[in-house]
C-alpha cells in the first residue's frame, strides 16, 4: 500500500477520505486505527456502527468521527480541532471477523497556523516534501493546492 498524505491546519478540521470497492467490501464494518510505533499493531481509534446498514451514521470517539458511504464506497474520517498530537500514521480498515484489510494508509500532517504559531522564517508553503518526493498529497485546507504522487517508506 502506498501512503496518502493529508495535511490540515492546527485548530481546524481535517477530512480524510478512503475510497474502496463497495462490492468487494459489501457488508463489512470499517475502522480507523493509528500506528503508534514502527512495529506493533494498529491501535483502533473509532469504528463504524455495529449494524452495517447504519454505517452512514457518524460515530465519534473524542474529536474523531467516522462515517461510511457503503453504496458509493467512501469511508470518511473527520478530525475536529486538529492538534499536533493528531499527526501520525493511520489506516482505514475493512473488518471481517477478527481480520482487517487495509483500505488506505494515511499520513496526517498538522501544519502550524502561519499567523499564530511560527517564526516568519518557518512559514509553510505548499510544495513537495523532501522525504516524500512522489507521495500523493491531499490538502484538506481552505485553499486548493498542488498535488503530487509519492511513495511511502516501508512500514511494518
Amino acid at each position: 500500500h502506498n501512503t496518502t498524505v493529508f495535511q490540515g491546519v492546527a485548530g481546524q478540521s481535517l477530512q480524510v477520505s478512503c475510497p474502496y470497492d463497495s462490492m468487494k467490501h459489501w457488508g463489512r464494518r470499517k475502522a480507523w486505527c493509528r500506528q503508534l510505533g514502527e512495529k506493533g499493531p494498529c491501535q483502533r481509534v473509532v469504528s463504524t456502527h455495529n449494524l452495517w446498514l447504519l454505517s452512514f451514521l457518524r460515530r465519534w470517539n473524542g474529536s474523531t468521527a467516522i462515517t461510511d458511504d457503503t453504496l458509493g464506497g467512501t469511508l470518511t474520517i473527520t478530525l475536529r480541532n486538529l492538534q499536533p498530537h493528531d499527526a501520525g500514521l493511520y489506516q482505514c480498515q475493512s473488518l471481517h471477523g477478527s481480520e482487517a484489510d487495509t483500505l488506505r494508509k494515511v499520513l496526517v500532517e498538522v501544519l502550524a497556523d502561519p499567523l499564530d504559531h511560527r517564526d516568519a522564517g518557518d512559514l509553510w508553503f505548499p510544495g513537495e516534501s523532501e522525504s516524500f518526493e512522489d507521495a500523493h498529497v491531499e490538502h484538506s485546507i481552505s485553499r486548493s493546492l498542488l498535488e503530487g504522487e509519492i511513495p511511502f517508506p516501508p512500514t511494518s
Partner: antibody
Framework: QVQLVESGGGVVQPGRSLRLSCAAS????????MHWVRQAPGKGLEWVAV????????YYADSVKGRFTISRDNSKNTLYLQMNSLRAEDTAVYYC???????????????WGQGTLVTVSS | DIQMTQSPSTLSASVGDRVTITCRAS??????LAWYQQKPGKAPKLLIY???SLESGVPSRFSGSGSGTEFTLTISSLQPDDFATYYC?????????FGGGTKVEIK
C-alpha cells in the same frame, strides 16, 4: 537501543548565541518528530520546541519564539537548537527527546537524552 | 496555555505505602496526559501516556487514571527505587505544558 546524546552547552554571555546538537541512534530518526525541553536549576520542566519528521513543521514555546530555531539533518541523524539573543532566564539543562508516536509531532516524550547545561551569565 | 497544577508538591511516604499524586488541568484535555519520573541529575523517564497506558518496561505498580481535567498517578506499593520527582504533562495544545512536579521523599 534508542540513544540521544546532546552537546554544545556551555557558558555564554547575555545576547550571544549558542547551537545545541542532539545525536540520535537506535531508531529510524527520519520517522519521528523531535522535541527540545529545558529545566532551569532546581526548577520544573519546560517544553521549548518540536520539529516534524521531515523538518517541514515546527512549533515553539512563546518564551523562545523568534529567538530559538529548531532544525534537523536526517542524513546525519542529528537534531539542532539554534539559540540567539540569549537571556539569563534561558539558563537550564536542555534535553532532546523523541516523540512517542511514529511520524508523530505532539505526543509524549520517550526517551530523553541526558541533557546539556547552558549557562547564560556575564 | 493550559495550566497544569500538581498536588501535593512534596509527599513523605514509606516503602510499601500506596501513593497518589493528582494533576489538574485548567481546561479539558480529554486523555492527553503523560506522567514522568525524574531522579536527581537524570533525565525524565516516561511512565504513563494517554492518561492510563503503561509504558513498556514500567512496573505494574504504577497506574494512571482520569480524563478531562482531573488525573491521578498511583503507586500501589512504594519501592525504594520510586523515591523521585514526578511530573504530569498535557499534550492537548500547541504548547505541551508540565505540572510543577511532586517530590516523593522518604518519611
Amino acid at each position: 537501543q534508542v540513544q540521544l546524546v546532546e552537546s554544545g552547552g556551555g557558558v555564554v554571555q547575555p545576547g550571544r548565541s549558542l547551537r545545541l546538537s542532539c545525536a540520535a541512534s537506535g531508531f529510524t530518526f527520519s520517522s519521528y518528530g523531535m522535541h527540545w525541553v529545558r529545566q532551569a536549576p532546581g526548577k520544573g520542566l519546560e517544553w521549548v520546541a518540536v520539529i516534524s519528521y521531515d523538518g517541514s513543521n515546527k512549533y515553539y514555546a512563546d518564551s523562545v519564539k523568534g529567538r530559538f530555531t529548531i532544525s534537523r539533518d536526517n542524513s546525519k541523524n542529528t537534531l539542532y537548537l539554534q539559540m540567539n539573543s540569549l537571556r539569563a532566564e534561558d539558563t537550564a539543562v536542555y534535553y532532546c527527546a523523541k516523540d512517542g508516536v511514529y511520524y508523530g509531532l505532539g505526543n509524549w516524550f520517550d526517551p530523553w537524552g541526558q541533557g546539556t547545561l547552558v549557562t547564560v551569565s556575564s | 496555555d493550559i495550566q497544569m497544577t500538581q498536588s501535593p508538591s512534596t509527599l513523605s511516604a514509606s516503602v510499601g505505602d500506596r501513593v497518589t499524586i493528582t494533576c489538574r488541568a485548567s481546561q479539558s484535555i480529554s486523555s492527553w496526559l503523560a506522567w514522568y519520573q525524574q531522579k536527581p541529575g537524570k533525565a525524565p523517564k516516561l511512565l504513563i501516556y494517554k492518561a492510563s497506558s503503561l509504558e513498556s518496561g514500567v512496573p505494574s505498580r504504577f497506574s494512571g487514571s482520569g480524563s478531562g481535567t482531573e488525573f491521578t498517578l498511583t503507586i500501589s506499593s512504594l519501592q525504594p527505587d520510586d523515591f523521585a520527582t514526578y511530573y504530569c504533562q498535557q499534550l492537548n495544545s500547541y504548547s505541551p505544558t508540565f505540572g510543577g512536579g511532586t517530590k516523593v521523599e522518604i518519611k
